[in-house]
């Protein structure tokens, strides 16, 4: 039986994220680490079957920038109420008999139930804040020791741009029951009969604290002569790049085009390509 926390997260993400851009948090223990502006690395999966895992590096983007900036703003999105109840049961029985001979019968039942009610809200980085932050600050020199380690390991580094968090403490309970029974009889000079039954009941309760991150969205960092943030995912993109020669670093003026609330940075691709 999978973790109750993982199951709830999966259901919330399925419901609220049809674009598939949110990455579910896989354990309650790590759920407080994923906050807007925090840096994460993507650890490739050991098998093609599993998705890559994201791991916090306990750094915020402001830790790698200078001059020291105040904690950048986040936008709080509207709250969603999420209610999920499940009650399922499967049962079956079988009997095998040959005329005047042995008889074997058995039955089994499995039931699973859970219910969750929670309020979830999003916290996201205002794109205009991003631009201001990157125009007013530069990559700290010398680079932060953690960044140097990640560079030497060739890891790609991402920044959390949006999170889905719980508004209040939530208790999630999941009950799993299994029952089975069987009997047999062997007719003959000495008639042998037997019967048995058993059940197993398992109950899991997990308390998800208020402000726990259930899922998050990321954008990749690009680091050459300075820090930048990639707007559109690119599977070939590397975070750490050799500084370009013979080109001035591009600086852009003006404000970020305003995006409707709740749209991710990735979704402005269409506008750029079709203007």
């Amino acid at each position: 039986m999978g973790s109750a926390f993982e199951r709830v997260v999966r259901r919330v993400v399925q419901e609220l994220d049809h674009g598939g851009e949110f990455i579910p948090v896989t354990s309650l223990q790590s759920s407080t680490g994923f906050q807007p502006y925090c840096l994460v690395v993507r650890k490739p999966s050991s098998s093609w079957f599993w998705k890559p895992r994201y791991k916090c590096v306990n750094l915020s983007i402001k830790d790698i920038l200078e001059p020291d900036a105040a904690e950048p703003d986040v936008q709080r999105g509207r709250s969603f109420h999420f209610y999920d109840a499940m009650d399922g049961q499967i049962q079956g029985s079988v009997e095998l008999a040959a005329p005047g001979q042995a008889k074997i019968a058995g039955g089994a039942a499995v039931s699973d139930s859970s219910s969750t009610s929670m309020n979830v809200y999003s916290l996201s980085v205002d794109p205009n804040t991003w631009q201001t932050l990157l125009h007013e600050a530069h990559l700290r020199q010398p680079e932060h020791a953690v960044l140097q380690q990640l560079a030497s390991a060739g890891d790609n580094v991402y920044v959390v741009t949006e999170v889905l968090q719980t508004q209040k403490e939530v208790e999630v309970t999941r009950t799993h029951k299994r029952e089975g029974s069987g009997r047999f009889s062997l007719p003959g000079a000495t008639c042998l009969q037997g019967e048995g039954q058993g059940h197993l009941s398992q109950k899991k309760t997990v308390t998800i604290p208020s402000g726990s991150t259930l899922a998050f969205r990321v954008a990749q960092l690009v680091i050459d002569s300075d820090l930048d943030v990639l707007l559109f995912p690119d599977k070939k993109q590397r975070t750490f790049q050799p500084p370009a020669t013979g080109h001035k670093r591009s600086t852009s003026e003006g404000a970020w085009p305003q995006l409707p609330s709740g749209l991710s940075m990735m979704r402005c691709l269409h506008n750029f390509l079709t203007d």
């Epitope: 794109p127 991003w130 631009q131 990157l134 125009h135 690009v222 050459d224 300075d226 930048d228 943030v229 990639l230 707007l231 559109f232 995912p233 690119d234 599977k235 070939k236 993109q237 590397r238 790049q241 370009a244 080109h247 001035k248 670093r249 591009s250 600086t251 852009s252 003026e253 003006g254 970020w256 085009p257 691709l269 750029f272 390509l273 203007d275």
Partner: nanobody, 121 residues
């Protein structure tokens, strides 16, 4: 200053192939999405293909899928459009466009002057 220079346009027979190149200078090429557009006489400019900053993702107009391939070489600051199985309706002026693909470059867009492709027997 910023420059995008397209080359490779020519007169070609239906079914033939061409490779267009767009050479960039004056900006950090690897931080820009690169696109090819085309404009036929009397028609609006239309998007043909786009490639992301490191070349990992590409996108094509339905009319050219399976026939055209966009690629880039960030070391040479060049984007290419390989055009196969050309049709008369592919006749147009082909333009190269650079769109900022990062936060620092987001408001920047540059266009080339265009190169003429004519498909005719």
């Amino acid at each position: 200053q910023v420059q995008l220079v397209e080359s490779g346009g020519a007169l070609v027979q239906p079914g033939g192939s061409l490779r267009l190149s767009c050479s960039a200078s004056g900006f950090t090429f690897s931080k820009y999405l690169m696109s090819w557009y085309r404009q036929a006489p009397g028609k609006e400019r239309e998007l043909v293909a786009t490639i992301t900053t490191a070349g990992g993702n590409t996108n094509y107009a339905d009319s050219v899928k399976g026939r055209f391939t966009i690629s880039r070489d960030n070391a040479k600051n060049t984007v290419y459009l390989q055009m196969n199985s050309l049709k008369p309706e592919d006749t147009a002026v082909y333009y190269c466009k650079a769109s900022g693909g990062t936060i620092r470059t987001v408001n920047e867009t540059y266009w080339g002057q265009g190169t003429q492709v004519t498909v005719s027997s």
